[in-house]
Interface confidence: medium
């Protein structure tokens, strides 16, 4: 009973975590304009992984996609890749874990097979969570570095003269969503791995670990990893990235081209 509960809870926690990772990846507020020295600014800038937005004091909002891959900073590309890898691994993990759930009967599937699948999904959730946490942390580090650089530039100029105030960016809501979501996915993965131990005898567990440790890297990496790094496969982002027409749910989840309408 405790095993079923642990497995079920692990699945639910991971599901919430992966939903959060997807939400964070799609959010526009990865970095937001720091208003410390400019609290009554006429425009408010914020940026996501896929586009940047400006909100006017009138409430009119304009978002414009980054319409080039080659011209984007390598760090941004890396963060995109990490988040997408995290989503893909998490999605595959969810699929595997559904069949692994003890409360779901599929034919005459043995507990040892369910244990193997539980462990596989658990490892995938852990890696997925780590990818998300790494992606968000890389972006946050990039922001911190740029923030203090632009702060220094604000007060030190040619011959001591104060330069024009630059727009400085600070942590956006997406970063916190990403950290929490990554953490939840990681916790869910750990719970799945713990549940795996109670699903089969010790000997089976040992075999499952040794087989899947190698089996994961051999069986999943070529298909899952490579497929996930092609941005084209992420239709939601591709639509926005290509601009032009947007599906209804995309327009709702993204403010719009003008983040001041």
């Amino acid at each position: 009973m405790a095993v079923t509960a642990c497995q079920g809870l692990g699945f639910v926690v991971s599901l919430i975590g992966i939903a959060g990772i997807i939400a964070a990846t799609c959010m526009d507020q990865w970095s937001t304009q720091d208003l410390y020295n400019n609290p009554v600014t006429a425009v408010f800038n914020y940026q996501g992984l896929w586009r940047s937005c400006v909100r006017e004091s009138s409430g009119f909002t304009e978002c414009r996609g980054y319409f080039t891959l080659l011209g984007l900073p390598a760090m941004l590309q890396a963060v995109r890749a990490l988040m997408i890898v995290g989503i893909v691994l998490g999605a595959i993990g969810l699929l595997v874990s559904i069949f692994a759930l003890k409360c779901i009967r599929i034919g005459s599937m043995e507990d040892s097979a369910k244990a193997n699948m539980t462990l596989t999904s658990g490892i995938m959730f852990i890696v997925s969570g780590l990818c998300a946490i790494a992606g968000v942390s890389v972006f946050a580090n990039m922001l911190v570095t740029n923030f203090w650089m632009s702060t220094a530039n604000m007060y030190t100029g040619m011959g001591g003269m104060v330069q024009t105030v630059q727009t400085r960016y600070t942590f956006g809501a997406a970063l916190f969503v990403g950290w929490v979501a990554g953490g939840l996915t990681l916790i869910g993965g750990v719970m799945m791995c713990i549940a795996c131990r109670g699903l089969a005898p010790e000997e089976t567990n040992y075999k499952a670990v040794s087989y899947h440790a190698s089996g994961h890297s051999v069986a999943y990496k070529p298909g899952g990893f490579k497929a996930s790094t092609g941005f084209g496969s992420n239709t939601k982002n591709k639509k926005i990235y290509d601009g032009g027409a947007r599906t209804e749910d995309e327009v709702q989840s993204y403010p719009s081209k003008h983040d001041y309408v």
Epitope: F60, R64, G65, F67, S256
Partner: antibody, heavy 119, light 112 residues
Framework: QVQLQQSGPVLVKPGASVKMSCKAS????????MNWVKQSHGKSLEWIGI????????SYNQKFRGKATLTVDKSSNTAYMDLNSLTSEDSAVYYC????????????WGQGTSLTVSS | DVVMTQIPFSLPVSLGDQASISCRSS???????????LHWYLQKPGQSPKLLIY???DRFSGVPDRFSGSKSGTDFTLKISRVEAEDLGVYFC?????????FGSGTKLEIK
């Protein structure tokens, strides 16, 4: 093909109001922004405002706030502009122009609606 | 508001000549996403404006390759390599980086 069909010329008396229309065809109406632009006789172009037909978001040029009101009817793919308290200064040709999210430019324009305010 | 200063007001040219129209913005037109939303339009007598060039140098569909755009800081230039009769009219530059969007005063291209 993309077409923006505007309503015909209007002659009104000072102090009156007018509503002009711009019917869009040949594209998905809610996927593009609609701008309104004023061109006084022999003068340059002045941007009045922009409307997001999807969510109803609007931004006006401060100069035209209170003068112009932008609306849309999504069911008929038509954008409207109301102009109130008209004076001779408002006599001009008014254009609607679609704006593409990729280019940020007004890529297709209506033929214009000529407004004459005269007593 | 961003002021777009266009020169010259009038540009007399001979057919087949090269024409160059300048437009200067009062502030940077580089959007926070890195794009520069400066566009060129041609308005022929009795017609509505038509988009020629968007984002400084991208030709709109159907626009001949004799039209090209370039930038240097806040100075923008539209070049017509070989002027044809159908190119005559008033050319406007416009920016959509900052609201309110603004237009240049126009340059009238006419036959010498």
């Amino acid at each position: 093909q993309v077409q923006l069909q505007q309503s015909g010329p209007v002659l009104v008396k000072p102090g009156a109001s007018v509503k002009m229309s711009c019917k869009a065809s040949g594209y998905t109406f809610t996927d593009y922004y609609m701008n309104w632009v004023k061109q006084s006789h022999g003068k340059s172009l002045e941007w009045i405002g922009i409307f997001n037909p999807y969510n109803g978001g609007i931004s006006y040029n401060q100069k035209f706030r209170g003068k112009a009101t932008l609306t849309v009817d999504k069911s008929s793919n038509t954008a409207y502009m109301d102009l109130n308290s008209l004076t001779s200064e408002d006599s001009a040709v008014y254009y609607c122009a679609r704006e593409d999210g990729n280019s940020g430019a007004m890529d297709y324009w209506g033929q214009g609606t000529s407004l004459t305010v005269s007593s | 508001d961003v002021v777009m200063t266009q020169i010259p007001f009038s540009l007399p040219v001979s057919l087949g000549d090269q024409a160059s129209i300048s437009c200067r913005s009062s502030q940077s037109l580089v959007h926070s996403n890195g794009n520069t939303y400066l566009h060129w339009y041609l308005q022929k007598p009795g017609q509505s404006p038509k988009l020629l060039i968007y984002k400084v140098s991208d030709r709109f569909s159907g626009v001949p390759d004799r039209f090209s755009g370039s930038k240097s800081g806040t100075d923008f230039t539209l070049k017509i390599s070989r002027v044809e009769a159908e190119d005559l009219g008033v050319y406007f530059c416009s920016q959509t980086t900052h609201a309110p969007f603004t237009f240049g005063s126009g340059t009238k291209l006419e036959i010498k």
